[in-house]
Amino acid sequence: ECGHISVSAPIVHLGDPITASCIIKQNCSHLDPEPQILWRLGAELQPGGRQQRLSDGTQESIITLPHLNHTQAFLSCCLNWGNSLQILDQVELRAGYPPAIPHNLSCLMNLTTSSLICQWEPGPETHLPTSFTLKSFKSRGNCQTQGDSILDCVPKDGQSHCCIPRKHLLLYQNMGIWVQAENALGTSMSPQLCLDPMDVVKLEPPMLRTMDPSPEAAPPQAGCLQLCWEPWQPGLHINQKCELRHKPQRGEASWALVGPLPLEALQYELCGLLPATAYTLQIRCIRWPLPGHWSDWSPSLELRTTERAPTVRLDTWWRQRQLDPRTVQLFWKPVPLEEDSGRIQGYVVSWRPSGQAGAILPLCNTTELSCTFHLPSEAQEVALVAYNSAGTSRPTPVVFSESRGPALTRLHAMARDPHSLWVGWEPPNPWPQGYVIEWGLGPPSASNSNKTWRMEQNGRATGFLLKENIRPFQLYEIIVTPLYQDTMGPSQHVYAYSQEMAPSHAPELHLKHIGKTWAQLEWVPEPPELGKSPLTHYTIFWTNAQNQSFSAILNASSRGFVLHGLEPASLYHIHLMAASQAGATNSTVLTLMTLTPEGSELH
């Protein structure tokens, strides 16, 4: 070996200085008598080496690196050899930090594996090989006096936890536990824990199960779940408290917590839930009142709450067939009485014959919002209910009676916008209990079965805004019927458009007769079109050769017009404008020439 490096310390604090010397022996005959020693850190040449010849003929170079900022690097001592750099010796330098104090040391006792598992946070990176050791001792008191030492627990590389097996534990007796971290730059120790392994016991959670329905037990109420749990047998003798958490399977709801529950409440009815909803449930337990750790949450149990009978008001309306008055068409609408009013599976219309106690005859059972049935001759009323698997809504009586109440007056309708109509009226005296408003297409598309209807519960209302099934350019028939205690008033109707179309074209003008100073014009009116409002008037316009304009307004029933006061032998442009409430349209232009003074008049 020609050269040898020695360093002040091969491992230093990151950023600290380091001093190195390189000695080249004299007997390296192939070297220059006065070789220049160079220093290289990693790939970079380092200036600042101080070189001297020693008394024994060896050459020495000393360099001080003011800050070692690499966590690992090779320092080389080199000579120029021809055109290349010859490395004579190199050393590995390392830089880093002494270990920080390990923190957040915590332990839990696992009764299944019979071991005490401790974990900690090692602190920031030291950049140096650092070993951690979990150290412990048995103590009779509060860890002030140290008893028998327990074998050190050394975690696997890179792990920040370690298991102390049961043979080194004493339950119901305190242990002192701490973590020691060590590297080349120093040693640190975590604060000491003093604990009884049983006080950090982490139990296994119970297993949640659905309760087997027993014939004598009442079924759960709507919005309730009956469940039970099977405790983890090995922890059965440990007093515990438990908590349950639940959330609906659908939606973004967060977990709701129920507790504390004693472990021994092996069966439980959980209420206040949404009816007919699938829930996910979990349970966990903790040693209590003595100290311990919460168990993990149990595997999920998925259960569905029973539904509740529908809580709805049924608004009803009916019509008799004109050809067969005993055939009744009954319509209804469910109005929820609560936020969660229960699912509706279907509807039943039934009749109870008088004198037949308990006998109820179903007239129809449907999922629709209407049904048609033959009303028995002695039946004056029927009952309507909504139902689901949990039961029925309160029956709504429907009384079939003649129209004996007073009629409303001044029924009128007006467009609000292209998709709504306002219908107004003057209420009769006495006030009705409410009104039924029906609407549908008027003639020629009118149909009784396609009508929409609404119940207005306020008998003092003087109008109603129709917003459903209203389209522009359609004629609607609107029928309003006042409702009284046991009867109704006569129905009134009115027709209206929510938006009408302007006439699509005006009639063509034809010249019938012409003279020197007059011209007789005629036209054939356009037939009325559905969705177009009737014409209100015509306006006829004429313009002479000097661009002077004249006009006359004619009523909508006009079929012709005579222009007077024209100039002889003059050119005129004439057109007709047909107007309705929705707008106006012009006809094509008719051009004509009046006769010369000497010419004979044309008829």
Partner: antibody, heavy 118, light 107 residues
């Protein structure tokens, strides 16, 4: 000092009934599981039944299920064993025991002898 | 049910001897194994719980080991007062079960 004192043993005919009591002192009775263990003359130990701290959980040995009922009165610090339909094979010394958190029987009473014979 | 098999059923030993009694469970019971000592006409007394934990007041010559299915009670140096019957008991799950007992007699 923990003390468990059994009483209620004696001679009873087959098919008859007996009620054993165990008076506990020296610890917070309501916090611990309790149990009954029996030992037939010249035989080994046999667990009979246990009861949780509040009385909600009561496991039984198959040999006594449906005939024996374990109960407790936390206000009186007393454990009971109601024995019905007694058989000759139920003849034994009955011990009352205080259970630890890991199911160990930490303290035992001195025992009471039950003899079932005609 | 979990069966507990104790062996030997009896043994003769002298004062100062090291005595070992084994207990085998028919299925894994983790560390839920307890040892009791019973002297004639007396109630049993807890020696070791949870396989290896010495009950307060019990001399340190008694020790327990094992886990899963195989367990051992060791008396490191038999004393005159140790001649008795020893029982193991599992408390892993109900029904709790005892071993048949090992009678330690004076040689």
């Amino acid at each position: 000092e923990v003390q468990l004192l059994e009483s209620g043993g004696g001679l009873v005919q087959p098919g008859g009934s007996l009620r054993l009591s165990c008076a506990a002192s020296g610890f917070t009775f309501s916090l611990y599981w309790m149990g009954w263990v029996r030992q037939a003359p010249g035989k080994g130990l046999e667990w009979v039944s246990s009861i949780s701290s509040s009385g909600g959980v009561t496991p039984y040995a198959d040999s006594v299920k449906g005939r024996f009922t374990i109960s407790r009165d936390n206000s009186k610090n007393t454990l009971y064993l109601q024995m019905n339909s007694l058989r000759a094979e139920d003849t034994a010394v009955y011990y009352c025991a205080k259970l630890g958190e890991l199911g160990q029987m930490v303290y035992w009473g001195q025992g009471t002898l039950v003899t079932v014979s005609s | 049910d979990i069966q507990m098999t104790q062996s030997p059923s009896s043994l003769s030993a002298s004062v100062g001897d090291r005595v070992t009694i084994t207990c085998r469970a028919s299925q894994g019971i983790s560390s839920y194994l307890n040892w009791y000592q019973q002297k004639p006409g007396k109630a049993p007394k807890l020696l070791i719980y949870y396989a290896s934990n010495l009950q307060n007041g019990v001399p340190s010559r008694f020790s327990g080991s094992g886990s899963g299915t195989d367990f051992t009670l060791t008396i490191s140096s038999l004393q005159p007062e140790d001649f008795a019957t020893y029982y193991c008991q599992q408390s892993f799950k109900y029904p709790m079960t005892f071993g048949g007992g090992t009678k330690v007699e004076i040689k």
